[in-house]
């Protein structure tokens, strides 16, 4: 049994920022889940993770230097990406995994969203492309 995910086919990131909404055929209320956003056709880069459970505040982080935040709806997670670079124009895939209660559930791979980054061309610093939210 797989969760279905809907995303916009394409988004344009003006001013190097974008909101990407991942809509699920599953209610996340009172579930323990891990929602993630992946970059590239092979989903090789995990851009951002939103972890939620029934007893804790939502936790959002990026291990790959993206500046991201996340908001939770009953059947959606919205990723807010900032400080994107023009060369980060790519296809981005939403992923959802429900860890509790059993059984473990995840999604059918979605069609993805092409994020086209326009606007100010930011120059990355060598070490920190952008802080990740703890």
């Amino acid at each position: 049994n797989k969760i279905l995910v809907k995303q916009s086919p394409m988004l344009v990131a003006y001013d190097n920022a974008v909101n990407l909404s991942c809509k699920y055929s599953y209610n996340l209320f009172s579930r323990e889940f891990r929602a993630s956003l992946h970059k590239g056709l092979d989903s090789a880069v995990e851009v951002c993770v939103v972890y939620g459970n029934y007893s804790q505040q939502l936790q959002v982080y990026s291990k790959t230097g993206f500046n991201c935040d996340g908001k939770l709806g009953n059947e959606s997670v919205t990723f807010y990406l900032q400080n994107l670079y023009v060369n980060q124009t790519d296809i981005y895939f939403c992923k959802i995994e429900v860890m509790y209660p059993p059984p473990y559930l995840d999604n059918e791979k979605s069609n993805g969203t092409i994020i086209h980054v326009k606007g100010k061309h930011l120059c990355p610093s060598p070490l920190f492309p952008g802080p990740s939210k703890p």
Partner: antibody, heavy 120, light 107 residues
Framework: QVQLVQSGAEVKKPGASVKVSCKAS????????IHWVRQAPGQCLEWIGC????????NYNEKFKDRATLTVDTSISTAYMELSRLRSDDTAVYFC?????????????WGQGTTVTVSS | DIQMTQSPSSLSASVGDRVTITCHAS??????LNWYQQKPGKAPKLLIY???NLHTGVPSRFSGSGSGTDFTLTISSLQPEDFATYYC?????????FGCGTKVEIK
Amino acid sequence: QVQLVQSGAEVKKPGASVKVSCKASGYTFTSYYIHWVRQAPGQCLEWIGCIYPGNVNTNYNEKFKDRATLTVDTSISTAYMELSRLRSDDTAVYFCTRSHYGLDWNFDVWGQGTTVTVSS
Amino acid sequence: DIQMTQSPSSLSASVGDRVTITCHASQNIYVWLNWYQQKPGKAPKLLIYKASNLHTGVPSRFSGSGSGTDFTLTISSLQPEDFATYYCQQGQTYPYTFGCGTKVEIK
């Protein structure tokens, strides 16, 4: 309380296999990875690999990919690490440990360790 | 793989001393760096996670700092129970890797 309890010490001959178990208790087994880490005498800690009990996905250190097999039995909240074609330099203490599946970066609870001695 | 280099490999110190251990990552790991304490015959214990966060129950004399490639573990006033080996570990990318340890001995 949260615990990882490992099986007892093993003595094996070169070329044999060993299977170490790690019984988890006190937490939701499917919310955490189980990792395996080894420490040879006087050596560094070395990550072998991990398994997520929810979907049984595994990640292996390339060094161990062809000799280590990680499995779980969720019905008894137990993880297993089997290492085949043992050599004398596999003599080490093998630890199981856990990291959170949603917040995966550190090992917060460890088993007591299982000493594996490989000797002819 | 990301290499983790700790220094010094060992040090001698007295009770009450301030002790600093460093860890260098071979590539940028942002803040995904953890510190562990290990005593002979025992499993490692988590001290600090995400570079600077104190794990539950760890005394406040332990602190961590750094980001990117260079990190520091500081013990502000060494206590008798702190004589042990300390390891850093990167949790940014698989395979997770450890430093080879810093042994803190009694002077």
